[in-house]
Interface confidence: medium
């Protein structure tokens, strides 16, 4: 069963946000961080196939403005009562008998149920408040240290303008039950009979505290000589205006593709992917496009030697088992984006980083770009998925899941529509069912799965994670063996 919290958020947003303007919160852990007036950065996506993530920077708008004063009050919207229940049951039985001979009978039932009842309300900043706020206050001088760091990385900064929050503490429960029975009798001189039955029940409960943010909306900050707030962010607009000129690195430092100073590795990655093609039209938004993007990225890896691949894989396996190491590696590579030397790290993150830098501490773009892309994909996935990828890496069983995920992405086109696909037994090996690695990998992407006749119900919102899962499997697989 996938994340119960995410499922609830998905249902609430589907119901209350028809304009698609709200950004769903992806984990309960981060749900308290998104409050009106809070500043967030949009972590650029390493691919066109999954969405950027928003991350709190633990600052409020008042922290970057002077004179210092509390933020203006927010408006509380009316409450919505949200009730979502799901109850499904499948059962079947079979009996085989020949007159006066053996009898075999069996039955099975699977049921799934969940119910959620909650009150949700909105908190928003009145659009007119921004005008007043910016008229009465101006950017603090000297600039806040965090803003300086974000400026040097070229990150875009946003302010939360509206949130959807829970009114009371809510308990969300999902139950999954399986039952099976069988009996047989063999008539003869001595009659032999037997029967057996069993059941398995799985229950997942999550408590969402009162005041948890389920989804939020943002406006973009533009910082030039003073601050401006764009309530309708423009894709081309940047928070910090880039410096007029950027120096190029000398080739001996390994500058391919060359990175102008102040440009992030992520933007360099996009230039590398599009190779001069306008960003939107770089790859078609379907499985062929995703595969082409992944192949473009992994092309460089095919030339790397065995020793380096081994070092990289060992480090990546460690990073997949350690969320803190994953974050540390991401931060270190972000630091290297602005072309400064990268600080060495300990543990598995350090092992990966060591492969990506020259003796000067500068990143080698040919190596850093595929790893930044891979980390971008990995950050879309859950901790459970990371652990399963580490296990598949260790046991060299990446190809099976790669083919399965690829096949589903290909079959599910167009991704914007719900559909049901049956799974070819050849792709499942001998393990399918709750708890099987392939099942968990897909379940964690937010797909509805069927066990008795293996099938998958495609959910449009699973696209980002599924594409990221495919990219992660493909790159790890490419590093660990000969490309197919």
């Amino acid at each position: 069963m996938g994340s119960a919290f995410e499922r609830v958020v998905r249902r609430v947003v589907q119901e209350l946000d028809h304009g698609g303007e709200f950004i769903p919160v992806t984990s309960l852990q981060s749900s308290t961080g998104f409050q009106p007036y809070c500043l967030v950065v949009r972590k650029p996506s390493s691919s066109w196939f999954w969405k950027p993530r928003y991350k709190c920077v633990n600052l409020s708008i008042k922290d970057i403005l002077e004179p210092d004063a509390a933020e203006p009050d927010v408006q509380r919207g009316r409450s919505f009562h949200f009730y979502d229940a799901m109850d499904g049951q499948i059962q079947g039985s079979v009996e085989l008998a020949a007159p006066g001979q053996a009898k075999i009978a069996g039955g099975a039932a699977v049921s799934d149920s969940s119910s959620t009842s909650m009150n949700v309300y909105s908190l928003s900043v009145d659009p007119n408040t921004w005008q007043t706020l910016l008229h009465e206050r101006h950017l603090r001088q000297p600039e806040h240290k965090v803003l300086q760091q974000l400026r040097s990385r070229g990150d875009n900064v946003y302010v939360v303008t509206e949130v959807l929050q829970t009114q009371k503490e809510v308990e969300v429960t999902r139950t999954h039950k399986r039952e099976g029975s069988g009996r047989f009798s063999l008539p003869g001189a001595t009659c032999l009979q037997g029967e057996g039955q069993g059941h398995l029940s799985q229950k997942k409960t999550v408590t969402i505290p009162s005041g948890s943010t389920l989804a939020f909306r943002v406006a973009q900050l533009v910082i030039d000589s003073d601050l401006d707030v764009l309530l309708f962010p423009d894709k081309k607009q940047r928070t910090f205006q880039p410096p007029a000129t950027g120096h190029k690195r000398s080739t001996s430092e390994g500058a391919w593709p060359q990175l102008p100073s102040g440009l992030s590795m992520m933007r360099c990655l996009h230039n590398f992917l599009t190779d001069g093609v306008p960003a939107e039209g770089a790859f078609t938004e379907d499985f062929q496009g995703l595969r082409a993007e992944v192949e473009t990225i992994s092309k460089e890896l095919e030339l790397l030697d065995r020793e380096l691949c081994q070092l990289l894989l060992e480090g990546l396996e460690g990073v997949l088992r350690d969320q803190l190491a994953l974050r540390a590696l991401e931060e270190a590579l972000e630091q290297g984006q602005s072309l400064g030397p990268v600080e060495p790290l300990d543990g598995p993150a350090g092992a990966v980083l060591e492969c990506l830098v020259l003796s000067s501490g500068m990143l080698v773009p040919e190596l850093a770009i595929p790893v930044v892309y891979l980390l971008g994909a990995l950050t879309m996935l859950s901790e459970t998925q990371h652990k399963l990828l580490a296990e598949a890496l260790e046991s060299q069983t990446l190809l099976g899941p790669l083919e399965l995920v690829g096949s589903l992405l290909e079959q599910s086109a167009p991704w914007q529509e719900r559909s049901t696909m049956s799974l070819p037994p050849g792709l499942l090996g001998n393990s399918w069912g709750e708890g099987a690695p392939a099942w968990v990998l897909l379940d964690e992407c937010g797909l509805e799965l069927g066990e008795d006749t293996p099938h998958v119900c495609w959910e449009p919102q699973a696209q980002g994670r599924m594409c990221a899962l495919y990219a992660s499997l493909a790159l790890l697989s490419g590093l660990s063996q000969e490309p197919h």
């Epitope: 390994g254 391919w256 095919e302 030339l303 065995r306 380096l308 492969c355 020259l358």
Partner: nanobody
Framework: QVQLVETGGGLVQPGGSLRLSCAAS????????MGWFRQAPGKEREGVSC?????????YYADSVKGRFTISRDNAKNTVYLQMNNLKPEDTAVYYC??????????????????????WGQGTQVTVSS
């Protein structure tokens, strides 16, 4: 713009020496295994020697050049060299350098197979004649 440029070729008498250089621009040479290949008129391209990236310590040579040729690299200069001593007329060919991959096998000869290479230079002519 990824480029490999070979220099140092020329006309030399049998028994003489030449030092070929392969300079890389637009990418970081030291993360790649590098190889030297040659193609004589009317013959197929063949592997001469290769050297592993900074992550390894291996050097391989074709039997025909063992003991006479030495491959080396200077990562700071983004350059790979081929020192050729005791040259013979059968060494006459256009010499190319290229990035090579032998990560998928422990067979030492695989790096000398042109098909596993990636980036290629435009070549430099070596003529051994009296």
């Amino acid at each position: 713009q990824v480029q490999l440029v070979e220099t140092g070729g020329g006309l030399v008498q049998p028994g003489g020496s030449l030092r070929l250089s392969c300079a890389a621009s637009g990418f970081t040479l030291d993360i790649y295994n590098m190889g030297w290949f040659r193609q004589a008129p009317g013959k197929e391209r063949e592997g001469v020697s290769c050297i592993s990236s900074r992550y390894g310590t291996s050097t391989y040579y074709a039997d025909s050049v063992k003991g006479r040729f030495t491959i080396s690299r200077d990562n700071a200069k983004n350059t790979v060299y081929l020192q050729m001593n005791n040259l013979k007329p059968e060494d006459t060919a256009v010499y190319y350098c290229a990035t090579v991959s032998w990560r998928f096998t422990t067979n030492q000869d695989v790096c000398l197979t042109p098909s596993v290479s990636g980036y290629w230079g435009q070549g430099t002519q070596v003529t051994v004649s009296s």
